[in-house]
């Protein structure tokens, strides 16, 4: 708690201080006072700097005195020693002995007391701009007229802040121009125009006279003009230094002017008006602006619109033009859109083809399709290639945005049949031959596959089976092999209309039309074990002749088994009908004259007892096409036989083209479209 | 009519193998998959291994892998099944079974050859 | 290797009742599955293939279900001549596994 004085005595003052003894008094006096501390007895031993034993006043950081020895009053009527005269309200005094005295030292009795500073003189700083005014234990500050104190109780200024300036035009003048400006003031000065508008400030070098810069290159008064988050300045000296018309793209401006104690000059004088804010000529890329103009202020209004091949991207929406508005600040509306490069997107991928990953998707790009070879191709024709469009779709020249078909190749074996290991009545063959054949378990028989969805066998393999069981892509018929190959699930079975259903089908004598249809659950794959074979046209090129050779597959009897293991299969050739008629029925349910022979059949066989037989029924009579010699088609179904290994009949196709064309169509799902 | 016939009954030590034969009759070893199957007193079935003549390999059961070893001399149309490292529990029937069509695990059986290993 | 599981391991039951085997594979066996019938002393005797079909021959009172993981062999009306060993089987790869068997004995 600060007291007005007090006294301060060495210990065991008056007797003898002891030896190494430190001990300190901090002094403190009210705010507003400084300290008088004097000494009116001092006996101390003596070394150089008192380094031994010592009093040492200390004042803040700065040490005012440090004492030893003996000392005595030089003015008979004052009994003090020695004093000190600080002018702040705290001290410390510390007392230090060592560890051994050769006399006996008595030590010393201060006191200190309260007096009175001068603020207004006894400072280097002086704490007031203009007058200073002291009083017991402070001080404060008073101004000149048309002056006022500002808030910090020092320092005086001239009240020239405040103004507001809305008007469109007008003139701004430091106080008193073209008179001395006050020093010590700091002038505001605000500008506030209607938005949309910016400030544009001219001022002429001759109006402008402000104290100039010191060695440092800092401005000791200044004029600054603010503007939002630009700023303009400071500016100082004869003439003003800056450009003598400012556009500040804002409608609010800050003038502000700051003067130091010293040095007052004329001042300045400018004018000001409002302009309609500008707004930038935008380069917008792959873009036309309309109307064009040379410039644009604010409330004008552009249309973008954006080149062909380019879009605007606002969220999920693309667009090919947008408005813009010169706004109030200067800056156009919607000046985050862009025109970009139209997306197409990552191209869709199609059944049995591919697309390569596009290395860009962007306007322009080019991407190929490709379907997987040998064993599809492009159905729908275009090359396969399609370059990205304006209107962000993948197009082809010929198709447009319409995808290409990837199917199937027919009549087309990875490996030839070669008749290669010589056995009664035909040849082991490998499924890879014959990829078109078709294994169907219940009952044992044959069918042909014609393409993804289709399976065309005889009538007489599923009249008693409408859910037969097939497989496709394996040459022997072992379980085990089944087991690896493709199982193919009917989904429906269409037998022909001209087909007779009898009720025991054991005695049947008239096979004519024996050919059905199924339409298979999932569409096949194919590839080097499962491939369609081709239909035959409906030209007179495939019109067959006696003598044309024909191949024929499967997994019927042998002369060895009722039911081969693997794959068999022989080249015939088509013979008259009557050879088939004149062959006497091995086992006949009827007369001979019973059987039926219609134009819709084809006799073949007769060669080296080469011939289909049981469990061979609905596979392919399979003929090199006549105009592309690459390709077999299905000319015949083994439908019937007089007897094993002579003559067989095989229901002629290209009698029911029409037939299978229309009952594929009409049972077609979307995905084959 | 295909017939599977085997040969006889053996008696064999422990470590020492064993040669079973199956004769066919009626067909072509070729065309046909011979597998083999074994049978312990009073236990169930284990399948040995087979001669896939589709990628032909011999594929044996892994539990024989390393043991068993099956040929077949097409000439004569017989096949054969070799065990070594005989231990008392390969004491079983040997069966040689053709593999069957269209999901026909297997068609014709052998008669069986008991193999007693004893010491 | 693809593990047949058969349940239960022994069965008993009358003349006249329905019996039902179940086998469970250790992954998916489409259809691929064989079940026979084991008598002593004699090979065993296949009854249904492709695990519904049944074998020429076989009584009707035998009927087999299932694809995939689960199969059932059902004796509908069980007979004198039922009571053997009965073993599953999967052919759909190799090895071709059989189940460990289950004895159909009188009760």
């Known amino acids: 708690e600060p007291t007005m004085y007090g006294e301060i005595l060495s210990p065991n003052y008056p007797q003898a201080y002891p030896s190494e003894v430190e001990k300190s008094w901090d002094i403190e006096v009210p705010e507003g006072y400084g300290i008088h501390l004097y000494f009116t007895h001092l006996d101390i031993e003596l070394s150089e700097n008192c380094a031994y034993d010592s009093v040492q006043i200390i004042s803040g950081d700065t040490e005012e005195g440090r004492l030893c020895g003996q000392r005595s009053s030089n003015n008979p009527h004052s009994p003090i020693v020695e004093e000190f005269q600080v002018p702040y309200n705290k001290l410390q005094v510390i007392f230090k002995s060592d560890f051994s005295n050769e006399e006996r030292f008595t030590g010393f009795a201060a006191y200190y007391v309260a007096t009175d500073i001068n603020e207004c003189t006894d400072f280097v700083d002086v704490p007031c701009s203009h007058f200073c005014n002291n009083f017991i234990g402070g001080y404060f500050c008073s101004c000149p007229p048309e002056y006022f104190l500002h808030d910090d109780m020092k320092n005086c200024g001239v009240n020239c802040s405040g103004d507001v300036f809305t008007a469109l035009i007008g003139e701004i003048a430091s106080p008193n121009y073209p008179k001395p400006y006050p020093e010590n003031s700091r002038c505001e000065y605000q500008i506030r125009l209607e938005k949309g508008f910016q400030v544009v400030v001219t001022l002429r070098r001759e109006d402008f006279d402000v104290e100039a810069a010191d060695s440092a290159g800092n401005c000791l008064d200044s004029l600054v003009f603010v503007a939002g988050d630009r700023q303009f300045g400071p500016y100082c000296g004869h003439g003003f230094p800056g450009p003598l018309n400012i556009e500040t793209k804002s409608n609010a401006l800050d003038i502000i002017f700051q003067t130091d104690l010293t040095g007052q000059k004329k001042g300045w004088k400018l004018r000001y008006h409002g302009d309609p804010m500008p707004c930038p000529k935008e380069d917008t890329p792959n873009s036309v602006w309309e109307p064009a103009k040379a410039k644009y202020v604010f409330r004008d209004v552009v249309q973008i619109t954006c080149l062909d091949g380019f879009e605007v991207v606002e969220g999920r929406v693309g667009a090919t033009s947008f408005y813009s508005t010169c706004q109030s600040n200067g800056k156009w509306s919607n000046s985050k859109l862009k025109c970009q490069p139209v997306d197409c997107g990552i191209p869709e991928s199609i059944e049995n083809g591919k697309v390569e990953d596009p290395e860009s998707t962007l306007f322009g790009s080019v991407i190929r399709y490709t379907c997987e070879e040998p064993y599809y191709y492009m159905e729908n024709g275009g090359g396969g290639e399609y370059h990205c469009a304006g209107n962000g779709s993948w197009v082809n020249e010929v198709l447009g945005p319409e995808l290409p078909k990837c199917v199937p190749v027919c009549g087309v074996p990875r490996e030839p049949f070669e008749e290669k290991q010589r056995i009664i009545g035909g040849s082991d063959a490998d499924i890879k031959n014959f990829p078109w054949q078709v294994f169907f378990d219940n009952p044992w028989a044959g069918g042909a596959l014609i393409n993804e969805y289709w399976v065309l066998t005889a009538a007489h393999v599923v009249e008693g089976n409408r859910e037969p069981t097939m497989y496709v892509g394996s040459t022997s018929v072992q379980t085990s092999r089944l087991a690896k190959s493709k199982m193919l699930t009917p989904e429906h079975v269409f037998i022909h209309p001209g087909w007779k259903l009898l009720e025991v089908p054991e005695g049947r004598t008239n096979f004519d039309n024996d050919i059905a249809l199924v339409r298979l659950k999932d569409p096949v794959k194919m590839g080097p074990t499962v491939s369609p074979i081709c239909l035959p046209g409906t030209s007179s090129d495939y019109n067959l002749m006696d003598g044309d050779l024909g191949l024929i597959s499967g997994w019927g009897r042998t002369e060895k088994r009722d039911r081969a293991v693997r794959l068999k299969a022989a080249r015939l050739p088509v013979a008259p009908l009557r050879k088939c008629k004149e062959v006497k029925v091995e086992k006949p349910t009827a007369d001979a004259e019973a059987y039926v022979f219609t134009p819709n059949m084809i006799c073949a066989g007769g060669e080296k007892g080469m011939d289909s037989c049981k469990g061979d029924s609905g596979g392919a009579f399979a003929v090199q096409d006549p105009n592309d010699k690459t390709k077999f088609y299905a000319a015949g179904l083994v439908s019937w036989g007089p007897q094993c290994g002579t003559y067989g009949l095989y229901t002629r196709v290209k009698n029911y083209v029409d037939w299978i064309m229309k009952t594929m169509q009409e049972n077609s799902t979307p995905r084959e479209d | 009519e295909v017939q599977l016939v085997q040969s006889g009954a053996e008696v064999k030590k422990p470590g020492a193998s064993v040669k079973v034969s199956c004769k066919v009759s009626?067909?072509?070893?070729?065309?046909?998959?011979m597998h083999w199957v074994r049978q312990a007193p009073g236990k169930g079935l284990e399948w040995m291994g087979t001669?896939?003549?589709?990628?032909?390999?011999?594929i044996y059961a892994q539990k024989f892998q390393g043991r068993v070893t099956m040929t077949e001399d097409t000439s004569t149309d017989t096949a054969y099944m070799e065990l070594s490292s005989l231990r008392s529990e390969d004491t079983a029937v040997y069966y040689c079974?053709?593999?069957?069509?269209?999901?026909?695990?297997?068609?014709?059986w052998g008669q069986g050859t008991l193999v007693t290993v004893s010491s | 290797d693809i593990q047949m599981t058969q349940s239960p391991s022994t069965l008993s039951a009358s003349v006249g009742d329905r019996v039902t085997i179940t086998c469970r594979a250790s992954?998916?066996?489409?259809?691929?599955l064989a079940w026979y019938q084991q008598k002593p002393g004699k090979a065993p005797k296949l009854l249904i293939y492709?695990?519904?079909s049944l074998e020429s021959g076989v009584p009707s009172r035998f009927s087999g279900s299932g694809s995939g993981t689960e199969f059932t062999l059902t004796i509908s009306s069980l007979q004198p001549d039922d009571f053997a060993t009965y073993y599953c089987?999967?052919?759909?790869?190799?090895?071709?596994?059989f189940g460990q068997g289950t004895k159909v004995e009188i009760k």
């Open positions: 009626g067909d072509t070893l070729t065309e046909l998959s």
């Open positions: 492709k695990a519904s």
């Open positions: 992954q998916s066996i489409s259809s691929w």
């Open positions: 001669f896939d003549p589709e990628e032909g390999e011999t």
């Open positions: 089987q999967q052919v759909n790869s190799y090895d071709w596994t």
């Open positions: 079974v053709t593999e069957g069509l269209a999901g026909f695990p297997f068609d014709i």
